[in-house]
């Protein structure tokens, strides 16, 4: 805190602003009749150096000149960039107890002359916007530096505006706040930036441009689309633009897409016809503008227009499958299933499906509409039946897809051979097979069908299926495949009027089952024991069970138990064993085995056979 220099003055030579690397002489002089006492020799002037308000040096040893008691001159060197404060104090040497008294102070700024500004670029946003220029100032000067932006144009006019840089703000951009109007489209402008500070000045090279070079049009606005005759594939995009625009760029894409369709339109005058749109698809449209065919800059993209194209009638064919179940000697139940069309085929919201079942010879026809993707009917077992399904939206219906209803597993000669199911990873299974050996008619296609082996799955859940061309012998099934679940997989070979099938079980990942089967009863019949059990609950199976094991040993025996291994069949829940001694008490239990290993044992049951055993 410097008092207002009552005691004396401080001056700097050559100036209070010096270039980096220069030395300066600081002179501290006492005013007349100011000092410690009547003896001038007892006046000692000292110079203290402060950086950021922190005392860093006493320059006592840097005196280059001394008028004892009146003035002292100190030489300061190696000053760092920025500002340094020097304070001169009076030290009365005959009174050690009094602190030095401030006399006066001075700030010395060390910096560099400005470099010529470079890379000037100017823009005007929109025909009614204002010109703003930016530049690269070069190295920091550490001094207050004034920048003047000068723009010279037609009719010998020059406009200018100023800003400054210091340690608090940077000046490398100026908005002139004035507009270049389109009537100057052909005129040339010259812009230059001059930088001045206490150590020098410099000027940029002149930068020349035209109105068209710097005006960036405003993005188009009020974008809308009109679909011709409610067409889903053709529409006229319309928008508003600034008056001078001669070139537009249009980009559009379905909302879930990652790449844009790009179109250039010359002299579009706010209108452009698009002919390749996808019906019933959410699209995003954006437009950019330019004032000149070859030069100038593109505007920013407009705000997006998001809209859905109208519907058109569905195309493509439905993927149909079916199940046949005999009800009694003269009736059968047909369940038809089909997969939804993908959006590019549906081309709208599917309102219903038209289903037809027709007996070919007697011309009996059953027709219905449904909103579901399945349909079940009871029909006579006699006759040759065909089914067809088509999908309808608000604009029309797809062409019907036909399928002949045949006995899917009726022809042994059409059964595929060597069907295998291998776990590929957590969520798919690779199914392979060999073609039927002695088919008397050509295989038209294979159908791989799968369904989780859980209670009620046939009635509760529709099947999943894949159509495979006749020359392919494998399928990777992944739809609805979950780990630790066993699936029944059927491979159907279909000819024009017959079907053959082979079945296998498979899983995508397996573990040993959580528990073993529960023995519910042991009965003795004709010198054989029948073991009955309940299957392991579905969630505890953890994959496909390959076989069950029945273990037995004499009660209280320490010997290894005997065992009998049974191939797993879902329909089987009892098994005979015949090697037990009569009137000996046995302990029995069961386990289940998957490809991953054996389950813990199920419940133990004791039994003592009565009859005579072999």
């Amino acid at each position: 805190n410097i008092d207002v220099c009552k005691l004396g003055t401080v001056t700097v030579q050559p100036a209070p602003v010096i270039p980096l690397g220069s030395a300066a002489n600081i002179s501290c002089s006492l005013n007349p009749k100011q000092g410690c006492s009547h003896y001038p020799s007892s006046n000692e002037l000292i110079l203290l150096k402060f950086v950021n308000d922190v005392l860093v040096e006493n320059l006592h040893g840097k005196k280059v000149h001394d008028h004892t008691g009146h003035s002292s001159t100190f030489q300061v060197t190696n000053l760092s960039l920025g500002m340094t404060l020097f304070v001169c104090k009076l030290n009365c040497s005959n009174s050690q107890k009094k602190p030095p008294v401030p006399v006066c102070g001075v700030e010395i700024s060390v910096g560099v002359a400005p470099e010529p500004p470079q890379n000037i670029s100017c823009v005007q946003e929109g025909e009614n916007g204002t010109v703003a220029c930016s530049w690269n100032s070069g190295k920091v000067t550490y001094l207050k530096t004034n920048y003047t932006l000068q723009l010279s144009g037609p009719n010998n006019l020059t406009c200018q505006k100023q800003c400054f840089s210091d340690n608090r703000q940077n000046c490398n951009r100026l908005d002139l706040g004035i507009n270049l109007s389109p009537d100057l489209a052909e005129s040339r402008f010259i812009v230059r930036v001059t930088a001045i500070n206490d150590l020098g000045n410099s000027s940029s090279l002149p930068h020349t441009f035209t109105f068209l070079d710097i005006v960036i049009p405003l993005p188009p606005w009020d974008i809308r689309i009109n679909f011709l005759n409610a067409s889903g594939s053709r529409g006229t995009l319309q928008w508003e633009d600034e008056g001078q625009v001669v070139l537009n760029q249009l980009r559009y894409q379905p909302l879930n897409s990652t790449s844009w369709n790009m179109v250039n339109a010359t002299n579009a005058k706010g209108k452009y016809d698009l002919r390749d749109l996808r019906p019933f698809t959410e699209y995003e449209f954006q437009i950019s503008s330019k004032l000149h065919l070859s030069g100038g800059s593109w505007s920013n993209w407009s705000e997006s227009l998001r809209t859905r194209t109208p519907e058109e009638e569905p195309v493509g064919i439905l993927d149909i499958w079916y199940m046949k179940q005999d009800i009694d000697y003269d009736r059968q139940q047909i369940s038809l299933f089909w997969k939804s069309l993908n959006p590019s085929e549906a081309r709208g919201k599917i309102l219903h499906y038209q289903v037809t079942l027709q007996e070919v010879t007697k011309k009996t026809t059953l027709q219905n509409t449904t909103r579901h993707t399945s349909w079940t009917r009871v029909i006579p077992r006699t006759g040759a039946w065909t089914a067809s399904v088509s999908a309808a939206n608000s604009k029309g219906a797809s062409a019907p897809t036909h399928i002949n209803i045949v006995d899917l597993c009726g022809t042994g000669l059409l059964a595929p051979h060597q069907v295998s199911a291998k776990s590929e990873n957590m969520d798919n299974i690779l199914v392979t097979w060999q073609p039927p050996k002695k088919a008397d008619s050509a295989v038209r296609e294979y159908i791989v069908e799968w369904r989780a082996l859980q209670p009620g799955s046939i009635t509760k859940f529709p099947p999943h299926w894949l159509r495979i061309p006749p020359d392919n012998m494998s399928a990777l099934i992944s739809e609805n495949i979950k780990p630790y679940i066993c699936y029944e997989i059927r491979v159907h070979a279909l000819s024009e009027s017959q079907g053959g099938c082979s079945s296998i079980r498979g899983d995508s990942k397996h573990k040993a089952p959580v528990s073993g089967p529960h023995i519910t009863a042991i009965t003795e019949k004709k010198e054989r024991l029948f073991i009955s059990w309940t299957h392991i609950p579905f969630p505890e199976q953890r994959g496909c069970i390959l076989h069950y094991r029945i273990y037995w040993k004499e009660r209280d025996s320490t010997a290894q138990p005997e065992l009998c291994e049974i191939q797993y069949r879902r329909s089987q829940n009892s098994h005979p064993i015949s090697s037990l001694q009569p009137r000996v008490t046995y302990v029995l239990w069961m386990t289940a085995v998957t490809a991953a290993g054996e389950s813990p044992q199920g419940n133990e049951r004791e039994f003592c056979p009565q009859g005579k055993a072999n």
Epitope: L151, G153, N155, L157, K161, G177, I178, N179, L180
Partner: nanobody
């Protein structure tokens, strides 16, 4: 009502300086472009200097370096500093005001809505 009142004119020797003032009432100078024009006897009115509302100054190249336009928002006034005066600078100097934002418009007198009565500057050799 809007009024512009010029002052500071007078007679001066060649090489001398003058500072013309324009006091504005009824409008705020910082909201408008302010201009100075001059008219010598028997000649058309010509553009001398202008300052846009954004404080950008515009000068004819022929007078650049000899003139400076400035404004004082607190006093609601605009000034024109004339240096190194020549006999051909003799004219009536007018202050003008208008909502102008274009480069060319700042130098066109028909873009300015309000005008002062003028102040005479005479430079003798």
């Amino acid at each position: 009502q809007v009024q512009l009142q010029e002052s500071g004119g007078g007679s001066v020797q060649a090489g001398g300086s003058l500072r013309l003032s324009c006091a504005v009432s009824g409008r705020t100078v910082s909201d408008y472009a302010m201009g100075w024009f001059r008219q010598a006897p028997g000649k058309e009115r010509e553009f001398v200097a202008a300052m846009s509302s954004s404080e950008t100054t515009v000068y004819p190249n022929s007078m650049k370096g000899r003139i400076t336009i400035s404004r004082d928002n607190a006093k609601n006034a605009v000034y024109l500093q004339l240096n190194a005066l020549k006999p051909e600078d003799t004219a009536v100097y007018y202050c003008s005001m208008g909502p102008i934002a274009t480069f060319q418009g700042l130098a066109r007198q028909n873009e300015y809505h309000y005008w002062g009565q003028g102040t005479q500057v005479t430079v003798s050799s």
